[in-house]
């Protein structure tokens, strides 16, 4: 199900992207699911739709609920759901778990903390950064574009980091804050030639025509924080974005999952409404880092309907 969880604080701006992707030329209609009421597109409204984006300027607790977005193309419609929760501002310093974005890990060499969701907003530098509610001061902290860099990271740098910025919409300014935890790893990491865990080499994946199918490309690259590690899908040797088939999209799974101490990445290829021509393509799962690139190829085959006997 194409559903995405989004959250924000009352009296702050919140912008939500439709979980279903489409070309910029496609129209996107937004509805409040509980009432099936259409969200207006006029910018004079506090809550309005702007293409793939749903904007709460500013958000109110009463805005919480499920919103439906329908991406309309000349040949198909795709539906997504945004589960939005707006919370009251906390009077004390503690940021509750439900307001936290994904934890990031850093090490002495790599200590970038990205400000979550900032790419959805119309903001201008500099960002303000806080750690455990205290404004960060000192030459060790550098706000650079949409991330914070900490020089000479120490274990004491672990904690909750909040970025604060101003979103500008038609001359009006709205505040936005986002918090995530930062952990410091002191163990020595290492990097290996990529190892693809899934799919198996030359795997044949059975699919049903007209149904949706998912392929997961999963690879591990070593231990600890990895530099320039990536997994991606290609169709017949072409990037997904260049292939030009909107039914086929890739989206990141878990970013860096440190299961068994290994640094791994996932990329999910989603094929909507599988067609006969999809069976003719070569689906390449590519995993690459500084050492090199490994490729596993998948082909699709038609699943034969099984007779169900009692």
């Amino acid at each position: 199900k194409f559903s995405k969880q989004s959250w924000g604080l009352e009296n702050e701006a919140l912008i939500v992207r439709c979980p279903r992707q489409g070309k910029p030329s496609y129209t996107v209609d937004w509805y409040y699911s509980q009432t099936n009421k259409s969200i207006p597109t006029q910018e004079r409204n506090r809550v309005f739709a702007s293409g793939q984006l749903l904007k709460f300027l500013p958000a109110a607790v009463a805005d919480s609920g499920i919103y439906t977005c329908i991406v309309r193309s000349p040949t198909f419609n795709r539906t997504g759901y945004a589960n939005v929760t707006i919370y009251k501002k906390q009077s004390d310093c503690n940021v509750p778990d439900y307001l936290m974005y994904s934890t990031v890990s850093g090490s002495e060499k790599n200590s970038k903390i990205y400000c979550p969701t900032i790419d959805l907003y119309n903001w201008t530098a500099p960002l303000e950064w806080f750690k455990n509610c205290q404004a960060l001061q000192g030459s060790r902290y550098r706000a650079h574009k949409s991330f914070l860099v900490i020089d000479n990271v120490m274990t004491e740098d672990a904690g909750d980091y909040t970025c604060k910025f101003i979103h500008n919409e038609n001359g009006a300014n709205y505040s936005v804050t986002a918090t995530r935890s930062f952990t410091v790893k002191d163990e020595q990491g290492f990097s290996l030639f990529p190892v693809i865990g899934a799919p198996a080499q030359n795997e044949i994946k059975e699919v049903e025509i007209g149904k949706n199918a998912n392929l997961t490309c999963s690879a591990c690259f070593g231990k600890g924080t990895q530099f320039l590690a990536a997994v991606l899908w290609q169709l017949n040797g072409t990037k997904i974005t260049d292939f030009g088939e909107p039914r086929i999209q890739q989206e990141e799974g878990q970013n860096q999952s440190f299961s068994n101490g290994l640094a791994c990445l996932d990329m999910v290829l989603r094929i909507a409404d599988v067609k006969e021509e999809d069976l003719l393509l070569q689906y390449d799962c590519l995993a690459l880092n500084l050492h090199g690139l490994r490729r596993h190829t998948v082909r699709l085959s038609r699943k034969n309907p099984i007779d169900h006997h009692s």
Epitope: F193, K239, H291, R295
Partner: nanobody
Framework: ESGGGSVQAGGSLRLSCATS????????MGWFRQAPGKEREGVAA????????FYADSVKGRFTISQDNAKNTLYLQMNTLKPEDTGIYYC????????????????WGQGTQVTVSS
């Protein structure tokens, strides 16, 4: 291959390799070199679908591998050359499902001599 020759340390050379007959999609292509009395050494590689590039540590920051699909040509731009870069440079293709500077290639060219004097 072409573009080899003699050059002083610190100089530059650009090697070219005509790759007609090689399927350009989903292919690993690269350069390796062999110095007299030494083992073959991988230099650089490129995965043609996406242009992902990989280099041996000894040449990182000095050498650049690139491709021109329209001309079916593979290049190796070599800057800040050192005497230890001396050897015969081979253009190579088809490394199966892996691509790196140390890939084992299934086909390669005749080679071009590069000599760097101090």
């Amino acid at each position: 291959e072409s573009g080899g020759g003699s050059v002083q340390a610190g100089g530059s050379l650009r090697l070219s390799c005509a790759t007609s007959g090689v399927t350009y999609r989903r292919t690993c292509m690269g350069w390796f070199r062999q110095a007299p009395g030494k083992e073959r050494e991988g230099v650089a590689a490129i995965y043609t679908s996406g242009g992902f590039t990989f280099y041996a540590d000894s040449v990182k920051g000095r050498f650049t591998i690139s491709q021109d699909n329209a001309k079916n040509t593979l290049y190796l731009q070599m800057n800040t050359l050192k005497p230890e870069d001396t050897g015969i440079y081979y253009c190579a293709a088809e490394a199966g499902d892996e691509c790196s500077a140390s890939s084992v290639f299934r086909s390669w060219g005749q080679g071009t001599q590069v000599t760097v004097s101090s």
